[in-house]
């Protein structure tokens, strides 16, 4: 067989994500092998003929691949010996998601998992105080999202409290006609309070924080992928 | 950080046997090859064997089969190298060394064997 | 076997100066070769791996290059610190082999 030992080699896939317009990694790990040219990675699609991306002895083969991934593939080739067989896919798109297969085979044995790549657009808000309103407002912008979020508010102290009587939220298409951008303006905010603006889609979490007092303005914003 | 921490230095008689030790710290064991490398007197350095603690797959250097025998224990987080039937020839600074994130990028301190009659 | 050729065996050469060492494969070995530094009575240390990429904390005046058959260890300016023994290796195959050496010496 030119296998020793064992015929089922351990992969493993973690479930991501994929930013549209931005470069995304399908991370996948195995049992490393000692040798470069004992190593096979082939990535495929569920529902695509042809192969997404395959490596093997120690170069790229992409005589099968498909289009839809042409010049869009490469794995961490330096990573490869040490049981890395994660692919970097370039400029994702709306439609690179689905179901994927890392297929791992080395001199030790063979392997395979699968994995869920979720697109869409996510990004991080940004909240600013609105000094041209008649009442102090907070605005909160984040440039891409897709698809449509929902979006809330909340504050330290009022917690708890709805502020979807007090806000004002819209989706403005971008120019690819895919992404949104997101507005919310909150009206009557007080000083010494710190607000939450919370952005959340089935891909990613996104939350900005802005903490108002008489001297100073301090912000805070964090980004969760969500299932990955 | 990672550490590989090699046994200290044996003299031996021709025909006898030396079991080098390798404890390592500081990644997990059972994740990656281990390699023993020879480096004789003045010489350059000569791949011996792997193993891959996880599932003690070896992979041997055919010229140091029969020779040198290795194995690990993983609750201890050690590999040994076994060196049998030593000659002078065998006489030699053993080095342990792994591939956490690139190939041999940690090193034991080496174990030098010395065989003389 | 492959066979990796290193040459110079010794080369030498003064600080500030720089270095180029090679390191020939019998057979394409892809990407497959890293170098190493040893010095007396030291363990060999990770300089370059997969023929290009600088291993962490590494100097940046040491690069790598090459694919196939042929590498390049380039040393842009010699430190005195760099005055050692230089290996070449391959993880294309097994067994896995090392290079003869190159021994870089204060001129």
């Known amino acids: 067989f030119g296998i020793s030992g064992k015929h089922f080699i351990t992969v493993t896939t973690f479930t991501s994500a994929g930013n549209i317009g931005e470069d995304g990694t399908l991370s996948c790990t195995f049992e490393p092998d000692i040798k470069l040219n004992g190593i096979v990675i082939q990535w495929l699609k569920e529902g695509i003929k042809g192969l997404v991306h395959e490596f093997k002895e120690g170069k790229d083969d992409l005589s099968q691949q498909h289009e839809m991934f042409r010049g869009r593939t490469a794995v961490f080739a330096d990573q490869v010996v040490v049981g890395n067989a994660s692919l970097r896919l370039k400029n994702v798109q709306l439609t690179d998601a689905g179901t994927y297969t890392c297929y791992i085979r080395t001199s030790k044995g063979k392997g395979n998992a699968n994995l869920e790549y979720k697109t869409g657009a996510f990004s991080m808000p940004e909240i600013n105080v609105d000094y041209n309103a008649s009442s102090e407002s907070l605005r909160c912008e984040a440039p891409r999202w897709f698809p449509q979020p929902t979006v809330a508010w909340a504050s330290q102290v009022d917690q708890g409290a709805n502020f979807s009587e007090v806000s004002n939220t819209s989706f403005e298409l971008n120019s690819e006609n895919v992404t949104m951008k997101v507005v919310s303006v909150l009206y009557n905010v007080t000083i010494n309070n710190t607000y939450s603006c919370m952005i959340e889609n089935d891909i990613a979490k996104a939350t900005g924080d802005i903490k108002v007092t008489d001297s100073e303005v301090k912000r805070r914003s964090q980004l969760q992928l969500l299932n990955s | 950080q990672v550490q590989l921490v090699q046994s200290g230095a044996e003299v031996k008689k021709p025909g006898a046997s030396v079991k080098v030790s390798c404890k390592a710290s500081?990644?997990?064991?059972?994740?990656?090859?281990m390699h023993w490398v020879k480096q004789a007197p003045g010489q350059g350095l000569e791949w011996i064997a792997a193993?891959?603690?996880?599932?003690?797959?070896?992979d041997y250097n055919q010229k140091f089969k029969g020779k040198a025998k290795i194995t690990a224990v993983t609750s201890t987080s050690t590999a040994y190298m076994e060196l049998s039937s030593l000659r002078s020839e065998d006489t030699a600074v053993y080095y342990c060394?792994?591939?956490?994130?690139?190939?041999?990028?940690?090193w034991g301190q080496g174990t030098m064997v010395t065989v003389s009659s | 076997e492959i066979v990796l050729t290193q040459s110079p065996a010794t080369l030498s050469l003064s600080p500030g100066e720089r270095a180029t060492l090679s390191c020939k494969a019998s057979?394409?070995?892809?990407?497959?070769v890293a170098w190493y530094q040893q010095k007396p009575g030291q363990a060999p240390r990770l300089l370059i791996s997969?023929?290009?990429y600088r291993y962490t904390g590494v100097p940046d005046r040491f690069s790598g290059s090459g694919s196939g058959t042929d590498f390049t260890l380039t040393i842009s300016s010699l430190e005195p610190e760099d005055f050692a023994v230089y290996y070449c290796?391959?993880?294309?195959?097994?067994?896995?082999?090392f290079g003869g050496g190159t021994k870089v010496e204060i001129k």
């Open positions: 060394t792994t591939t956490v994130a690139h190939y041999f990028d940690y």
């Open positions: 500081g990644y997990t064991f059972t994740s990656y090859w």
């Open positions: 193993i891959y603690p996880g599932n003690s797959d070896t």
């Open positions: 057979q394409d070995v892809s990407f497959a």
């Open positions: 997969s023929a290009s």
């Open positions: 290796q391959q993880h294309y195959n097994t067994p896995l082999t």
